[in-house]
């Protein structure tokens, strides 16, 4: 009796199971009673990632520079190119398909993570102590200067946003 | 002067291949991402393929997938476009052309992109049988 | 894949009188670093394609300040301010934000 469901790696057709191509390959022709299926490698710039039945290999990936993209892994017969942003940008998704900028941390706040091709800046408030008077992608909050180790006085308290001001001690006495 | 020359074009039989060639001068050929744009006799222009200024990364256009395959030798500056299968609908003038850029520092190509700023002659391909 | 459509298909211009030529694209060419990924090319009698204008209203260089672009998202419009004799030809727009990239069908334009 002819069967109705296949093995794992198998296709059903005309009742019979057929193996299914490996990655790498796309089907030329279905087996027969008489004959294995006939696969053929996928082309350069080319690739199939599963076992498969496919008639056309995919096309890999283009990573367009228009777009700031650019190759991060170049593409196999069983794997599709991947791509990265260039420098300054990161990916919108996880397939990144378009980038955008990294973002800036404005004035009192300083950079947490540094942003990658795949994940933006990730910015943290300045604590008490700490200070950030630029807005950048890369500068972590800086610590107040310490007057008392270079034998001045504050002489205007600092904030998230800026150092404290030291000035010499007052030394008339009263 | 920058400029690209194709050829490689002639008569063909439907079925048969034919190699294009375009030749770069006068400009650092490794930098720059290529184009193949064809125009069908009486036609509009149509994008056939790109590929990446290494060589790494290419894209053809639905209608030659699978038949046609950009590629490219740096070492001698020139782009190639391997047509096989031809059919009487490839019939066309086939241009050559560069993918304009600008600051090759960091964001350069994102922020600075030109247009194709320099097309080849062409070079004329007809499949008839 | 992104569908250009530009109009009119024919173009029958003065010399010396402004002329326009729409493009419409089936999806946003607006990228997120704010540029519009649009080129217009002029194809001239028996030449080559040649760059006008990229990034939607960037002239190309060594092309004439009567030619300039405008738009953005999906609509697009190239205007010559002063027509010349040498401007006849075919003009296409082309978008460059996807690939494959796709032309617009082209707008004849041609001296009355």
């Known amino acids: 009796e002819p069967p109705t469901a296949c093995r794992e790696k198998q296709y059903l057709i005309n009742s019979q199971c057929c193996s299914l191509c490996q990655p790498g390959q796309k089907l030329v022709s279905d087996c027969t009673e008489f004959t294995e299926t006939e696969c053929l490698p996928c082309s350069e710039s080319e690739f199939l990632d599963t076992w498969n039945r496919e008639t056309r290999c995919h096309q890999h990936k283009y990573c367009d520079p228009n777009l700031g993209l650019q190759v991060q892994q170049k593409g196999t017969s069983e794997t599709d190119t991947i791509c990265t942003c260039e420098e300054g940008l990161h990916c919108t998704s996880e397939s990144c398909e378009s980038c955008v900028p990294h973002r800036s941390c404005l004035p009192g706040f300083g950079v947490k993570q540094i942003a990658t091709g795949v994940s933006d800046t990730i910015c943290e408030p300045c604590p008490v102590g700490f200070f950030s008077n630029v807005s950048s992608a890369f500068e972590k909050c800086r610590p107040w200067t310490s007057c008392e180790t270079k034998d001045l006085v504050v002489q205007q308290a600092g904030t998230n946003k800026t150092d404290v001001v030291c000035g010499p001690q007052d030394r008339q006495r009263a | 002067q920058v400029q690209l020359v194709e050829s490689g074009g002639g008569v063909v039989q439907p079925g048969r291949s034919l190699r294009l060639s375009c030749a770069a001068s006068?400009?650092?050929?490794?930098?720059?991402?290529m184009h193949w744009v064809r125009q069908a006799p009486g036609k509009g222009l149509e994008w056939v393929a790109v590929?990446?200024?290494?060589?790494?990364?290419?894209y053809h256009a639905d209608s030659v997938w699978g038949r046609f395959t950009i590629s490219r030798d740096n070492s001698r500056s020139t782009l190639y476009l391997q047509m096989n299968s031809l059919r009487a609908e490839d019939t066309a003038v086939y241009y050559c052309?560069?993918?304009?850029?600008?600051?090759?520092?960091?964001?350069?190509?994102?922020?600075?992109?030109?247009?194709?700023?320099?097309w080849g002659q062409g070079t004329t391909v007809t499949v008839s049988s | 894949d992104i569908v250009m459509t530009q109009s009119p298909l024919s173009l029958p211009v003065t010399p010396g009188e402004p002329a326009s030529i729409s493009c419409r694209s089936s999806?946003?060419?607006?990228?997120?670093?704010?540029?519009?990924?649009l080129d217009w090319y002029l194809q001239k009698p028996g030449q080559s394609p040649q760059l006008l204008i990229y990034?939607?209203?960037n002239r190309a260089s060594g092309v004439p300040d009567r030619f300039s672009g405008s738009g953005s998202g999906t609509d697009f419009t190239l205007k010559i301010s002063r027509v010349e004799a040498e401007d006849v030809g075919v003009y296409y727009c082309?978008?460059?934000?996807?690939?494959?990239?796709?032309f617009g069908q082209g707008t004849k334009v041609e001296i009355k």
């Open positions: 990034l939607g209203s």
């Open positions: 590929i990446s200024n290494d060589g790494d990364n290419k």
């Open positions: 052309a560069r993918r304009g850029m600008g600051s090759s520092g960091s964001r350069g190509d994102y922020y600075y992109y030109y247009g194709l700023d320099v």
């Open positions: 006068g400009f650092t050929f490794s930098s720059y991402g």
């Open positions: 082309m978008q460059a934000l996807q690939t494959p990239r796709t």
């Open positions: 999806q946003s060419l607006l990228y997120s670093n704010g540029y519009n990924f």
